[in-house]
């Protein structure tokens, strides 16, 4: 059972407008609350139903928040990060990192992988498509003989 877990990492700018009950999500992380080993970053731990983030639909549980209104979230205490969000104003711009987990190898394996690995389907799909095109061209060529 030694399949590899790869990650497709993407970054996105998400602009949220604070709703009646705020931004509508929870966070974990910080220099004094490392949620991910060797990473003191700030992560989304919960999206609240019908909150601003949920209604927008782009922010996901597990996303890493890199900055708020252009302010870097590196090396912040957990409470300082919370306060930064609370004082961020009505229109809030979030730079977030999404990590899409892609399963390679035997199903059921859930280990840590190389975050920068290329998902196998990105290789297999073009190869499969090329094979199909080649097979079709070969069949057409044989019919003409």
């Amino acid at each position: 059972m030694n399949g590899r877990v790869d990650y497709l990492v993407t970054e996105e700018e998400i602009n949220l407008t604070r709703g009646p009950s705020g931004l509508g999500f929870n966070i974990v992380g910080g220099t004094d609350q490392q949620y991910v080993s060797n990473d003191s970053g700030i992560y989304v731990s919960r999206i609240k139903e019908n909150g601003a983030a949920a209604l927008d639909g782009r922010l996901q549980e597990g996303d890493k928040i890199l900055s708020v209104n252009g302010q870097d979230l590196k090396n912040l205490l957990h409470q300082d990060a919370v306060d930064l969000f609370r004082n961020a104003g009505y229109a809030v711009s979030l730079r977030v990192q999404h990590r899409l987990q892609v399963q390679n190898g035997p199903i059921g394996h859930r280990g840590e992988g190389d975050p920068s690995g290329i998902p196998i389907f990105m290789v297999l799909v073009p190869v499969f498509a090329l094979t199909m095109v080649a097979a079709w061209a070969f069949m057409r060529y044989r019919q003409q003989l």
Epitope: S21, G22, L23, G24, F25, N26, I27, V28, D32, Q33, Y35, S45, R46, K48, E49, H78, Q79, V82, F85, R86
Partner: nanobody, 127 residues
Framework: QVQLVESGGGLVQAGGSLRLSCAAS????????MAWFRQAPGKEREFVAD????????YYADSVKGRFTISRDNAKNTVYLQMNSLKPEDTAVYYC?????????????????????WGQGTQVTVS
């Protein structure tokens, strides 16, 4: 999946004390916001108290302020509710609740929807 198990409830005379405990499973207990709620027969579930991830911030319902104290021990994955000067109106089933992480919003402490996990409850009866 987090499991919460309450203990310490019982029958006590008015003016007496009880200490409730809530043991949580899961290695990330120290990141949870923890709370106690209670529900008396025929009434809505009512917020009692909550505590942030490291115990640095606590919040209480007006009805228990000065009598109840919430605390936590992250090394033991446990949250406590020390209840002093108990009154008959404190009679209820007491529930422990956990929210993953800290809200980035000004707190809506009293809303049960803020919490992801719930215990089965422990009965407290004040005669």
């Amino acid at each position: 999946q987090v499991q919460l198990v309450e203990s310490g409830g019982g029958l006590v005379q008015a003016g007496g004390s009880l200490r409730l405990s809530c043991a949580a499973s899961g290695r990330t207990f120290s990141t949870y916001t923890m709370a106690w709620f209670r529900q008396a027969p025929g009434k809505e579930r009512e917020f009692v108290a909550d505590i942030n991830w490291n115990g640095g911030s606590t919040y209480y319902a007006d009805s228990v302020k000065g009598r109840f104290t919430i605390s936590r021990d992250n090394a033991k994955n446990t949250v406590y509710l020390q209840m002093n000067s108990l009154k008959p109106e404190d009679t209820a089933v007491y529930y422990c609740a956990a929210a993953i992480g800290s809200t980035v919003d000004s707190y809506y402490h009293s809303d049960p929807l803020e919490y992801d996990y719930w215990g089965q409850g422990t009965q407290v009866t004040v005669s």
